[in-house]
């Protein structure tokens, strides 16, 4: 149960928790029984776990002190459950020159300070992308910056001081891209009140198509925390996210190994996002690319994912093959695609939850099919699930800890594939482990790129 006793304070906490989870994690309050305190709590508990998991709290399923504290923290109004990288539907601006207009100014700050804070916030994103932003003072801008209080012309009214600080809409026409700041906050240039620059960097991230990140160091983390604006920098997670949408700055501004430049195959620090066999080949996925290794041959070739499968996204996170069916399953965020005979099947992507994962699972780190048992192993954070491909359902008793059942592997893995009828090859960062699943132990430790003769 999320809560056991029914004091008025705890009742208030439950109601507050429900509203928070409805707003940011999609809890369907209509599905909760009227007698909430007697309610067994599965729906609520699952959403609490989902929130705790996303925001890096201890996953208890209870409305404990740290969870309630986090729920009361000032934050962005955009929901959390759409996994990081892009907003649902994946909108991006289809151009590199983007205009913005400041519709009205908060009385809390000098106009020049507002202009400066907003300009610097856009600059944060233009520094790491090919995007160029220019301010216009009249006419229709792509991104409208608005200070408003309460109900203000969308479905998402502000809530007074504290709570929701701002929200923004992903790229698109009309309201698309617009960033709204709650005028009931006290906006500042410093650490007092709410810092406009820091909030604007976050909201512009949404305006460009990013969703929330579960990395507490990321500017796209949902809650507000002041950091020194003079030393402020985007996290690696933020940069990876925005560059997956727009690429990196061109020519002389090039970043080291951005998402859209081909990674060096023999870089000793190279890691992979996903690896799977496809017939007698091995596919190694990284960012927008995959390498193709034909078994027992030294030659490898690099390709864009989009050149083979134009409808698939970059940044594939997990993959597995069922060779007997000529099927390959590819995963990104909470969606998966089915490839049959190297062709994408129609009516995909579909939700990973159709496999039977609980709602707090938002992405798969790695997956592997074992044809001997006709089971697929799904690795998520430090746990794994086992799925019966014949019965099309999860085996009971899962998830289990990776470290408990795969000796020497874990706690988390990046990728895994099955080969030679007895080995799993686990990838963790730049390391790879050959694991004999019959002996249940590691038989070799290799570099991740050892398959390429590096």
């Amino acid at each position: 149960l999320p809560l056991n006793s029914s004091t008025s304070l705890e009742k208030n906490n439950v109601l507050f928790g429900e509203r928070y989870l409805e707003k940011f994690y999609g809890l369907e309050i209509n599905k909760l029984p009227v007698t909430k305190m007697k309610y067994s709590g599965n729906l609520m508990k699952e959403k609490i776990q989902e929130m705790q998991h996303f925001l890096g709290l201890k996953v208890t399923g209870q409305l404990d002190t740290s969870t309630l504290e986090m729920m009361h923290a000032p934050r962005c109004g955009v929901p959390d459950v759409h996994h990081f990288r892009e907003m649902p539907g994946g909108p991006v601006w289809r151009k590199h020159y983007i205009t913005y207009r400041i519709n009205n100014y908060t009385p809390d700050m000098n106009r020049e300070d507002v202009d400066y804070a907003i300009r610097k916030a856009f600059q944060v994103w233009s520094n790491v992308t090919p995007l160029k932003f220019s301010k216009i003072n009249t006419g229709m801008a792509d991104i409208l910056v608005v200070f408003a209080r309460g109900a203000h012309g969308d479905f998402h009214a502000f809530d007074g001081k504290g709570g929701i600080l701002a929200h923004a809409f992903g790229p698109g026409s009309g309201i698309g891209g617009d960033a709204h700041f709650d005028e009931d906050e006290f906006w500042t240039t410093h650490s007092g009140g709410t810092n406009l620059f820091l909030t604007a960097v976050h909201e512009i991230g949404h305006s460009l198509g990013l969703g929330h990140s579960s990395d507490p160091k990321a500017v796209m983390f949902p809650t507000y925390k002041y950091v020194d604006i003079n030393t402020f920098r985007l996290s690696a997670d933020d940069i990876r996210g925005i560059q997956s949408l727009y690429g990196d700055p061109k020519e002389n501004q090039r970043l080291p190994n951005p998402d859209n430049s081909e990674p060096a195959l023999c870089d000793p620090n190279l890691s992979f996002d996903a690896v799977t066999t496809v017939g007698n080949k091995i596919f190694f996925f990284k960012d927008r690319f995959f390498w193709l290794k034909v078994s027992e041959r030294p030659k490898t070739s690099v390709n864009l994912i989009s050149s083979l499968w134009p409808t698939l996204p970059s940044g594939i996170e997990a993959a597995y093959e069922i060779e007997a069916r000529n099927q390959v399953f590819l995963f990104k965020d909470d969606k998966y695609w089915l490839i049959s005979n190297l062709r994408p099947e129609p009516n995909y992507p579909k939700s990973i939850h159709s496999f039977g994962f609980p709602n707090f699972v938002k992405k798969i780190d790695a997956a592997v099919f074992n044809p001997r048992f006709y089971r697929t192993y799904f690795f998520v954070d430090n746990q794994y699930w086992r799925y019966d491909e014949r019965r099309q359902m999860m085996d009971p008793g899962y998830p289990k800890l990776i470290t408990k059942n795969f000796q020497g592997i874990g706690p988390k893995i990046d990728a895994v594939f099955y080969s030679k009828n007895k080995y799993y090859y686990f990838f963790q960062g730049s390391n790879q482990f050959e694991y004999d699943f019959l002996l249940q132990r590691i038989t070799k430790t290799l570099k991740s790129n050892s398959w390429f003769g590096c």
Epitope: E22, K23, Y25, G26, L27, E28, N30, V78, P79, V81, H82, M87, P88, G89, P91, N103, N104, M140, L144, V146, A148, H152, G153, D154, F155, H156, H167, F169, G170, G172, S173, G174, I175, G176, D178, S351
Partner: antibody, heavy 122, light 103 residues
Framework: EVQLLESGGGLVQPGGSLRLSCAAS????????MHWVRQAPGKGLEWVSY????????HYADSVKGRFTISRDNSKNTLYLQMNSLRAEDTAVYYC???????????????WGRGTLVTVSS | DIQMTQSPSSLSASVGDRVTITCRAN??????LNWYQQKPGKAPKLLIY???SLQSGVPSRFSGSGSGTDFTLTISSLQPEDFATYYC?????FGQGTKLEIK
Amino acid sequence: EVQLLESGGGLVQPGGSLRLSCAASGFTFSDYNMHWVRQAPGKGLEWVSYIGPSGGYTHYADSVKGRFTISRDNSKNTLYLQMNSLRAEDTAVYYCAKDIRGAYSSGLFDYWGRGTLVTVSS
Amino acid sequence: DIQMTQSPSSLSASVGDRVTITCRANQSIYTYLNWYQQKPGKAPKLLIYAASSLQSGVPSRFSGSGSGTDFTLTISSLQPEDFATYYCQQAGIFGQGTKLEIK
């Protein structure tokens, strides 16, 4: 071609219940917010409810809050409106409408169904 | 709460006329205003979104303008098929409608 087809309307007594359905085709249903809008005979349009792409996020007009429940089944490309404790003033043609956006609704309806008539009368 | 007031509530005009319908919000809604056309027994059809953007497939004789609290829908030269009811809307709020009839 985008198509929305409502069904489930009919005559119901005050206090009764009805479940409306809206079958969607011609677009990726699971990517978009969906809405119900109603129109009483000879009157204007009234927004009723909306639901987010995954089914989690719902909003209701004050006039139906606590009585109506919006839901969706993305595997069937179908939107639903469960209407309980119906009143005479709920008599209207109910339209389902597709939002132009797939995240954080703007309430801009680019496609509408033909509507289904709900009559609440004893 | 935001309210939308449309005027006039009805209007008689002739083919070829220039017609203007106005919509006023009781507080600023920036450019978040849309216009719909509805013919008897039919579903509404989106004409203009974001105050002035023409929805694809809508004839260019329809135009929208305004921002903040005051908005207008203009039909530059009325055609027989334009006689209908017009609604302004933002988020979950519709204006009460303007019925455009043949004079």
